[in-house]
């Protein structure tokens, strides 16, 4: 049996076109071999009419083509201007005509019946515009023009050239009479409703000599496109409603009971609370198309979504719409990760971000979701060594633990860091995840001096006090830079006296810088980890100055507040800068986020995935 498949019977009428799709197993050999369409002769041969190698029979010249789609394992034969002579038995196949890798197709072309009652069929999508053309003869050029709709047995006047408009069509219909040269008038109906479908009659003149033309208007409700996405993953709805609604407010809504469609997000600034922190409506293109990204998908997000355009920013009768049926797969490939991470003012958080482990070489990013306007997510850090200026010294993206997870550490927390953050890569866009950072009451667990000044050529010792709760953790010091935090040698100096009610298991671990140079200036972190999993960190800025008096410096906690020094942050840190990423393709499939990094100087980023899974800031 041949592995080629296609339609066994194709029926059409004279003058029409057909598109015959033939399916083949998309092996490497099949993808590249010759494709053909041939007509079977009475004696069993098969005469090639068209092939993928450029041959076209004179019978098909100018009216047929063959297109191969190797990625789908299909090729399509289009034949136009059919005549009854085209009726017959054909084969679509691969390789050589006589070799059997083919499929038999019967094509039957009947005589065209012409349109019954001279009826013109108009098939138009819901919310769009139809133009019904009505020809007339010269003798009726000066007479009344009208359009009727057949309701049951009776024609009901819809519009006429004397100015009448049926109330059901007010504000969305017009009658145009072409210039004197053309014997034609047109009726244009906008914002088509399902109820507009039916039989129409246009008429020029009112007596027995009037010209009449029948029209059948079919209004199509869009079939939902089926979308299957993983729990905790991400979905993008691409909405292209056409340039005629480019300047009309756009919306995405989710159908609830009956005909209700609850707005999820719109361009007028509305956003459903359930989507706070995990939705972006990307700016629309000139042609009116836009896209909506939802991350942190939940079971309850499944359902029917409509995007549309209406001045109210919500679904109304006559809105042009597109539809999707979203299914959320609970057997998700995206691992569970905390959706809420808690930290204290002055403390830190370590956020675990999942990514598709097949894409270990992809660039990783972390951005802060902002709800203003339609939502956006300016980048804060990436895995290629870029960190947003306001976050220098307190934010790091680490490739560890790897194998499908990376880590983001943010310290020197303030209440302004509370919000929703997104983890993403320039690879699989379905793996965007969200996490909410909450700032709670409490003191940081690690105690370090606030700021430290070292003297050129001298030795500096910086203490970090670890409470006993971290006794089983690895303790480290490192020097922060844009690409991470490079580990430094440190000394365990025994139990710390910085904690009340903490036994011998508390620890004082010092960083020692010998013969300080200008290169030693910068941010230093002390922290705890277990293997490749990071816990709390604390940051100290070390300034370097000229020698004033001899000796080494030993910094104690008493010399500085336990809270981190915040002067590195701009006073304008909270303002949303206008350079945040606004490229609509940023969160679409086509464009790597990296391309827009230089635009990413907006504020910080955030994300909600709304479940109750929570992670404290101090440990995993």
């Amino acid at each position: 049996k041949s592995p080629i498949f296609g339609p066994e019977e194709v029926n059409s009428v004279e003058g029409n076109s057909v598109s015959i799709t033939c399916y083949y197993p998309p092996t490497s050999v099949n993808r590249h071999t010759r494709k053909y369409w041939c007509r079977q002769g009475a004696r069993g041969g098969c005469i090639t009419l068209i092939s993928s190698e450029g041959y076209v029979s004179s019978k098909y010249a100018g009216r047929a083509n063959l297109t191969n789609f190797p990625e789908n394992g299909t090729f399509v034969v289009n034949i136009a201007q059919l005549s009854q002579d085209d009726s017959g038995r054909y084969k679509c196949g691969l390789g050589i005509n006589s070799r059997g890798l083919s499929f038999d197709v019967s094509l039957e072309v009947s005589q065209g019946p012409g349109l019954l009652n001279d009826t013109k069929v108009y098939t138009v999508d819901l919310g769009r515009t139809v133009t019904i053309n009505c020809p007339f003869k010269t003798e009726n050029a000066q007479k009344r023009k009208s359009l009727y709709k057949q309701i049951g047995l009776y024609p009901v006047l819809v519009i006429d050239s004397s100015g009448y408009v049926n109330p059901n069509y007010t504000g969305r219909i017009r009658l145009d009479i072409q210039g004197t040269g053309q014997l034609l008038f047109s009726v244009v109906i906008n914002q088509l409703r399902l109820s507009d479908a039916g039989q129409y009659l246009c008429q020029a003149g009112d007596d027995s000599n009037s010209n009449k033309k029948n029209a059948d208007l079919q209004v199509l409700k869009p079939e939902p496109e089926l979308v299957y996405e993983d729990l905790r993953g991400s979905v993008t709805f691409h909405c292209a409603l056409g340039p005629e609604v480019a300047n009309v407010a756009k919306f995405l809504c989710r159908q609830s009971s009956g005909e209700n469609c609850d707005v999820v997000v719109n361009t007028l600034g509305k956003r459903a609370p359930a989507f706070e922190g995990r939705i972006l409506l990307n700016p629309q293109d000139k042609d009116g198309s836009f896209s909506v990204v939802i991350t942190g998908l939940r079971k309850e997000d499944a359902g029917r979504y409509l995007c549309g355009a209406h001045s109210d920013g919500q679904l109304q009768e006559g809105s042009p719409i597109q539809a999707w049926q979203l299914f959320v797969n609970e057997e998700s490939t995206i691992p569970r990760s905390p959706t809420v991470v808690k930290g204290v003012a002055g403390g830190s958080v370590a956020v675990l971000c999942p990514y598709n482990r097949k894409e270990s070489k992809s660039i990783k990013y972390w951005c802060l979701w902002e709800g203003a306007q339609n939502g956006r997510c300016p980048l804060l850090v990436d895995s290629e060594g870029w960190v947003k200026a306001q976050y220098e010294g307190r934010l790091s993206l680490l490739e560890e633990p790897g194998n499908g997870t990376f880590t983001v550490i943010l310290n020197q927390l303030t209440s302004r860091d509370a919000g929703f953050y997104w983890c993403l890569t320039n690879g699989d866009t379905l793996w965007r995840t969200t996490v909410e950072i909450k700032i709670i009451e409490g003191e940081p667990n690690l105690k370090v001096p606030g700021n430290v000044t070292a003297v050129l050529g001298e030795t500096l010792k910086v203490p970090c006090h670890f409470p006993c709760k971290f006794s089983s953790y690895e303790k480290y010091w490192c020097k922060w830079n844009n690409t991470g935090c490079q580990a430094l040698p440190s000394q365990d100096e025994g139990p710390s006296k910085a904690f009340v009610n903490c036994d011998e298991n508390s620890r004082l671990v010092s960083l020692t810088l010998n013969l300080v140079t200008r290169a030693d200036e910068g941010w230093y972190w002390c922290g705890v980890k277990q293997g490749h999993f990071y816990g709390e960190t604390a940051a100290v800025y070390v300034a370097v100055e000229e020698r004033k008096a001899a000796g080494s410096r030993d910094v104690s906690l008493a010399k500085a507040d336990a809270a981190p020094d915040e002067k590195v942050l701009d006073s304008g840190f909270r303002e949303i800068e206008n350079k945040a990423i606004q490229d609509p393709r940023l969160f679409a499939e086509e464009k790597a986020v990296a391309d827009t990094r230089d635009q990413a100087d907006g504020s910080r980023a955030s994300v909600d995935s709304g479940s109750s899974e929570e992670q404290g800031g101090s440990s995993r």
């Epitope: 029926n11 029409n16 399916y23 299909t74 399902l194 479908a197 209004v219 199509l220 079939e223 049926q325």
Partner: nanobody, 131 residues
């Protein structure tokens, strides 16, 4: 929402014939804008493609049949009644299965044998062929 209701199943002797019907309702679109077809599922087996009928417009349509039943099937439809029919001849015991009517509004852009591409499924009608 499109509803599909199958009928015409039953018990038949090997070599006999059956005509299955599937009535569609509930759509704002014209019936010819849908691809309609049939799948079947025998006990303990996967659902498999039987036949499909796709309309490109009011006068152009394409009929597809499964290799396993080639020459024994005829699919047709009555657009006025919004009904699709499957005439099955020379039935064999291995044709015993639940036959499902399917529909999709996707048009011609996919392999009609791919069951994932059908948005609407009927409840199914049992066909039993005794030897």
């Amino acid at each position: 929402e499109v509803q599909l209701v199958e009928s015409g199943g039953g018990l038949v002797q090997a070599g006999g014939s059956l005509r299955l019907s599937c009535a569609a309702s509930g759509s704002g679109r014209t019936f010819t804008s849908y691809t309609m077809g049939w799948f079947r599922q025998a006990p303990g087996k996967e659902r498999e493609f039987v036949s499909a009928l796709t309309w490109a417009d009011d006068s152009t349509y394409y009929k597809y049949y499964a290799d396993s039943m080639k020459g024994r099937l005829t699919i047709s439809r009555d657009n006025a009644k919004n009904t699709v029919y499957l005439q099955m001849n020379s039935l064999k015991p291995e044709d015993t299965a639940v036959y499902y009517c399917v529909a999709t509004g996707r048009g011609l852009t996919y392999d009609p044998r791919d069951r994932r591409k059908y948005d609407y499924w009927g409840q199914g009608t049992q066909v039993t062929v005794s030897s």
